[in-house]
Every structure is written in C-alpha cells, then in structure tokens.
C-alpha cells in the first residue's frame, strides 16, 4: 500500500446559469484556445509516493514529455527558487548518476523518466509535507521543472487509484493526428472568435467542482501550461527540510498521470520500456519554468499566457554554479 500525490490538472470555469448554447460558446473556444496555446510545449510530471511499510521512505518519479534530448535531470527537495532547495540527485544520460543522502537509489526508468528512492530513517529523512522538484534540462528546449508533494492528510494505509487517462501513442500517426486536430482547432477557434467578437461576453462563474473529486477529461495536451494558467503559486513549508544538506535552487512545475510507450534506447541503466506519465489528480502545487539550458539565468519574460516563471536572481551560473550555493 502506498500514498500517492500528484499535482492537479485544472478544469476551465463552469458557466453559471447559461443556456446550452452559452455553455458551448464558452467552453469550446476555451478548450481550443488551451490546445493552441499549449501545443508543442514540453511538460514535466512528478509523482511522490510514501511507502506504507516505511512511513518516512519516499519514491519520487519524474518524467519529461518533450521532443528534445534530455541533457540533465536534477531532483531536489525543499521547494522552488527562493525557498532554498537541496539537491538529492543529478542524472546525466551519458556520464552517469550522482546522489546525496538521504537519496538511496536514483535510476533511469526510461529515456525520459527517472525514479529516486529516499532513505526512510535518519535526521535528514523527508516527511509527508516535503516538496520534491524535478528539473529536466533538455536540448534545445531549455530547462523545465515540476514540483510535487504529499498532501498533509495522506494516509499511507490508503491508496487512491489514479484517475485513468487515455494512452498516448508516441508514433508518427499519433503525432500527425494530433497536429491535424490542433490545426483544425486553431482555425475553428479563429472562426468562432470572429463570429462572436461583437457579442457581449458571458460572465464567468467560479467553478463549483469539489476539490476532492477531479473530473475526467477526454484529452489534455499540456499539463504544464494548463495548470499554470490557473493555479496560484503557493509555498509549502517543509518542516522536515534537512539542515545537513546544502542548498540548491529548484523551481516549481506541473504534474499528473497517463501511460506513454517509450523506446528505451542508449540509457546506461537499462530502463524499462514503459513510462508512467501523468493523469489528473488533486493536491500539491504547480508552477512551471522554461529557462534555456544554454542561457541559464536569462529567463524569457513570458512562456505563454499566465505562466508563472521563477527566474534565477543570481544570473547565469554564479560562482557557485548553476544550482546555486551547494
């Protein structure tokens, strides 16, 4: 048995007392806009599990959904930039793996996902409200980071089954199909916008969806961008943050789950052939960063509408290196 926590995928606000036509007018352009805005955006997902057998033992799994080659993965805890994160492991696809206590075993699961097991005892062991972050430096896309943590109410004896999501096939047909849908969607969105530009916009009502009951969606192409469009950034106090380790500076990011076939070529640890990738779930916080790996510290001012960025205040790789004072 284990407790799982994933970052929420959020839904667009539900309309209030609108007619059926109003509902369609509001939701369809919103969905299409999201598809257009987020198409092609790399994503990072994070899963944090607490093992029921060892209550202070954690497994962190992270993955990258993007077309570039992963050049480095950094796993840390303690929160995003400014919160003084601590590096737990660094995985390099060619040069190997480095890990620091309480990390017990870091490994590549697939070409684009990693897992890290943390020791369950000692002064530096994590606890349930610890925030874990995974940063993927991808070439040429840049650096993308996501954070996740177990919600405070997690019961290690219970394991809520993750909400299922459709399997995304990463083959040529799938890519062409998705591209076609996106292209059609964007064109249709423009058509709708032109058709309705003179109509008064309906007032949006706040969503009445229960935070404990995530709704399933047919397809959500970009967790990172969608979640960041809606979720306010929140810092989770990590009372268990170790004093024994030195600080780095991880940033925040998105996560949720699906299944994605991945070809596990040329990874040193001989990863499995399947990657677990995110599906919608509630709890934790989300943020996203896209800082070019080749221009660390020089963050773009915007990465799409409403995205929360955490630029490196120290500038490009200050004397203590790209992860800050370590």
């Amino acid at each position: 048995m284990r407790t799982e926590a994933q970052v929420p995928a959020l839904q667009p606000p539900e309309p209030g007392l609108e007619g059926a036509m109003g509902h369609r007018t509001l939701v369809l352009p919103w969905v299409l806009l999201t598809l257009c805005v987020t198409a092609g955006t790399p994503e990072v997902w994070v899963q944090v599990r607490m093992e029921a057998t060892e209550l202070s033992s954690f497994t962190i799994r992270c993955g990258f959904l993007g077309s570039g080659s992963i050049s480095l993965v950094t796993v840390s805890w303690g929160g995003p930039n400014g919160a003084g994160g601590t590096t737990l492991a660094v995985l390099h696809p060619e040069r190997g793996i480095r890990q620091w206590a309480p990390a017990r075993q870091a490994r590549w699961e697939t070409q684009s996902s990693i897992s890290l097991i943390l020791e369950g005892s000692g002064a530096s062991s994590p606890c349930a409200n610890t925030t874990f972050c995974c940063k993927f430096a991808s070439f040429p896309e840049g650096s993308w980071e996501a954070c996740g943590s177990l919600p405070p109410s997690s019961d290690p004896g219970l394991s809520a089954p993750p909400t299922p999501a459709p399997i995304l096939r990463a083959d040529l047909a799938g890519i062409l199909g998705v591209s076609g849908v996106l292209l059609f969607g964007c064109v249709y969105l423009l058509h709708l916008l032109r058709r309705h530009k003179h109509r008064p916009a309906p007032r949006l009502q706040p969503s009445r969806t229960s935070p404990q009951a995530p709704r399933a969606r047919a397809w959500a192409p970009s967790q990172a961008s969608q979640a960041a469009l809606h979720v306010p950034y929140a810092t989770i106090n990590t009372s268990c943050r170790p004093a024994t380790l030195d600080t780095a500076h991880p940033h925040g990011g998105p996560s949720w789950w699906a299944s994605l076939p991945t070809h596990a070529a040329h990874r040193p640890q001989g990863p499995a052939a399947w990657a677990s990738t995110p599906i919608p779930a509630r709890g934790s916080f989300v943020s996203v960063e896209n800082g070019l790996y080749a221009q660390a510290g020089e963050r773009p001012p915007h990465t799409g509408p409403g995205l929360t960025l955490f630029p490196d205040p120290r500038g490009p790789r200050a004397m203590e290196g790209p992860l800050g004072v370590r």
């Epitope: 080659s69 060619e94 190997g96 030195d246």
Partner: antibody, heavy 117, light 107 residues
C-alpha cells in the same frame, strides 16, 4: 572565496610513484565532482581523471591502472596516486571542480610533476 | 572518444579587432561545451559555459555560440589583456576532451 590548492608534485624517476593532493575551501566539497587535468610543457590541456561525490571514478585510457583518484569529503581533499610513472606523464597537474554535468569552473594553480632519470 | 578540433591554432590580431575561434566536435555534443582562457604560467579560467552563457565576472565582449558539432568563441573588441591561449572543452561524455588550443598573439 572558492580555492583549490595542489601539492605533492616533484621530480621522480620513470617507474616511480607520486601522490598529489588538492585542498579545497570556500565551497561544499562533497557536492561537486573533482577532476585532475594536466598540461605537458608547451602543450595543450588534457583531462586525466574524475571522481564523483560518492567515489565514482573515471580515467583517461593512458593512465588507467596506473593512476588512482580518491577523495576525503570530511577533509575537503582530493588525491591522485600516480604509479609506474613515465616520461610522458611530465606535466603541470591541475585540480579542478565541476558541478556535475555543467563543466569545470574552478581551477587550482597547478603542481608540477617531472618524470626523468 | 569525442575529438575536439580547434581552429586556428594561432592568430595575430590588434587591439580592437574582432576575433573568432571555432571548435568542431567529432559527434554531436548538444551544448555541453565550455571555453577557457589561459595565460602563460597561470591556470585556465572559464569564460563561457553551456556553449553560449557568459561566466559570471567575464567581460561581455566575450560571447559563445553554436550547438551540436560547431561552436564559436568571439571576442568583439580585442583588449590587451585578451592575448592568451583559448581552449574549448566538451563535457558530454568520458573521456572529457579539450580542443588543441588557439594562441591569440599581438600583431
């Protein structure tokens, strides 16, 4: 201030041994990969060896089996044990820091090793 | 092993000149490349990391570009203190390898 200070260089006969040391200060030593890089007189730079934070080691082919890199995190110290030395090993040896995966950023001033009969 | 071929091996230039040094990798190294400056009797000093990012404290007249197999170090306006030898280093894979060096001399 981040500093790396090498010592232990000197004149040694072919086939002899020498142990180089590097004292690190001003940063958290255990969080970094540490390298030895050498430069023969009038020549370019040549990477020799790397050791990860937990003791993972990597060597240049020509020194493998003869050189041993090691570290003592508690003492902020890096070492290079050089055995079966050859004339071709004559060089200035630099101790270098790397934040793993991001390249070498801080270099020591170097220590000179001369292998000659 | 990844070979790094640096050119030219030496060049003569005057103060104020624009200087370009190139480094070619025998296989793709993404942007896992740094540029270093070395003066006689001194240790190397890093100028550029990740192919194009300027190391903290290094003057902005130095810039790096390129990715994959072709990389360039440019000094926009050569200063008297820039006369030195420059090396590129790939840190994608073991063994880490340096370019042969480019000596920039006063014309």
């Amino acid at each position: 201030e981040v500093q790396l200070v090498e010592s232990g260089g000197g004149l040694v006969q072919p086939g002899g041994s020498l142990r180089l040391s590097c004292a690190a200060s001003g940063f958290t030593f255990r969080n970094y990969d540490m390298h030895w890089v050498r430069q023969a007189p009038g020549k370019g730079l040549e990477w020799v060896s790397d050791i990860g934070n937990s003791g993972e080691t990597y060597y240049l082919g020509s020194v493998k089996g003869r050189f041993t890199i090691s570290r003592e995190n508690a003492k902020n110290s890096l070492y290079l044990q050089m055995n079966s030395l050859r004339a071709g090993d004559t060089a200035v040896y630099y101790c270098v820091r790397e934040e793993f995966g991001y390249g070498m950023d801080v270099w020591g001033q170097g220590t000179t090793v001369t292998v000659s009969s | 092993d990844i070979q790094m071929t640096q050119s030219p091996s030496s060049l003569s230039a005057s103060v104020g000149d624009r200087v370009t040094i190139t480094c070619r990798a025998s296989q793709g190294i993404r942007n896992d490349l740094g540029w270093y400056q070395q003066k006689p009797g001194k240790a190397p000093k890093r100028l550029i990391y990740a192919a194009s990012s300027l190391q903290s404290g290094v003057p902005s007249r130095f810039s790096g570009s390129g990715s994959g197999t072709e990389f360039t170090l440019t000094i926009s306006s050569l200063q008297p203190e820039d006369f030195a030898t420059y090396y590129c280093l790939q840190h994608l894979d073991y063994p880490l390898t340096f370019g042969g060096g480019t000596k920039v001399e006063i014309k």
